[in-house]
Interface confidence: medium
Amino acid sequence: RTVPPMVNVTRSEASEGNITVTCRASSFYPRNIILTWRQDGVSLSHDTQQWGGVLPDGNGTYQTWVATRICRGEEQRFTCYMEHSGNHSTHPVPSGKVLVLQSHW
């Protein structure tokens, strides 16, 4: 069986002038997947991305994520590329309000 992933891209404040963009793929099967950030249509090198492992999500399917830090204003140059079971898609960084993540002590 093949279950295609649901892909979701989010952005969050990282530091002044920078944002972290995260691409999440969920509810997919089998577990083999390519998920990577591209800049100007080219995959970023491994040392500029952070990956979560491919983990079971409890429903017999899998989930994973990849994140990278980019300069605010360059969002249009970045897309998340996903390849799974012979299908592929690209997903842009959402525009609009930046989600500010705050730590509550």
Partner: antibody, heavy 121, light 112 residues
Framework: QVQLVESGGGLVKPGGSLRLSCAAS????????MSWIRQAPGKGLEWVSY????????YYADSVKGRFTISRDNAKNSLYLQMNSLRAEDTAVYYC??????????????WGQGTLVTVSS | DIVMTQSPLSLPVTPGEPASISCRSS???????????LYWFLQKPGQSPQILIY???NLASGVPDRFSGSGSGTAFTLKISRVEAEDVGVYYC?????????FGPGTKLEIK
Amino acid sequence: QVQLVESGGGLVKPGGSLRLSCAASGFTFSNYAMSWIRQAPGKGLEWVSYISPGGDYIYYADSVKGRFTISRDNAKNSLYLQMNSLRAEDTAVYYCTTDRRHYGSYAMDYWGQGTLVTVSS
Amino acid sequence: DIVMTQSPLSLPVTPGEPASISCRSSKSLLHSNLNTYLYWFLQKPGQSPQILIYRMSNLASGVPDRFSGSGSGTAFTLKISRVEAEDVGVYYCMQHLEYPFTFGPGTKLEIK
């Protein structure tokens, strides 16, 4: 081994057009972003244009924007530069280069031998 | 646009002696991913340019280890520990951080 061979240069009058080609071999062309770089006689290097592997991202230097068009045919392993409304200041050797800045490697690691474009009346 | 400057523009060197070329950018080339997008190229007489250093301090494949790159966000240095006759040519720095990519004016290294 990797080879990039430019062609299509020559003498053209101001306002005229030329189409440069770059034939690539020795590597998987469709995986590489490409750039055109030019060098006026006796001068330094100037980046002209960039195209992503799939052709979906394209950038130009302000000096050529609206006059030059970069394109590629991955089936033919070829890169092109259509140059319209040519000016005397476009006179240069034009180099075709690979662009690998994101591969954990380096940028513009392969260059062609260049093709000379001369714009003169 | 990011402006790149180099000094000196001409550098006569005795074979076996060290050489140093400076490059400056009008804006920091340090990306938020912690890479510094500064490159060094050498164009030997009558040849196409070839890459020497990528991301400020990484030696490109096949380049002799007498070459090294260093720097910070806006100030960069290319060093040759012992100049050889084959090192003659024009050295260019280039920023690859943002469009348009821009080169320095070049430093011509010649043998005394």
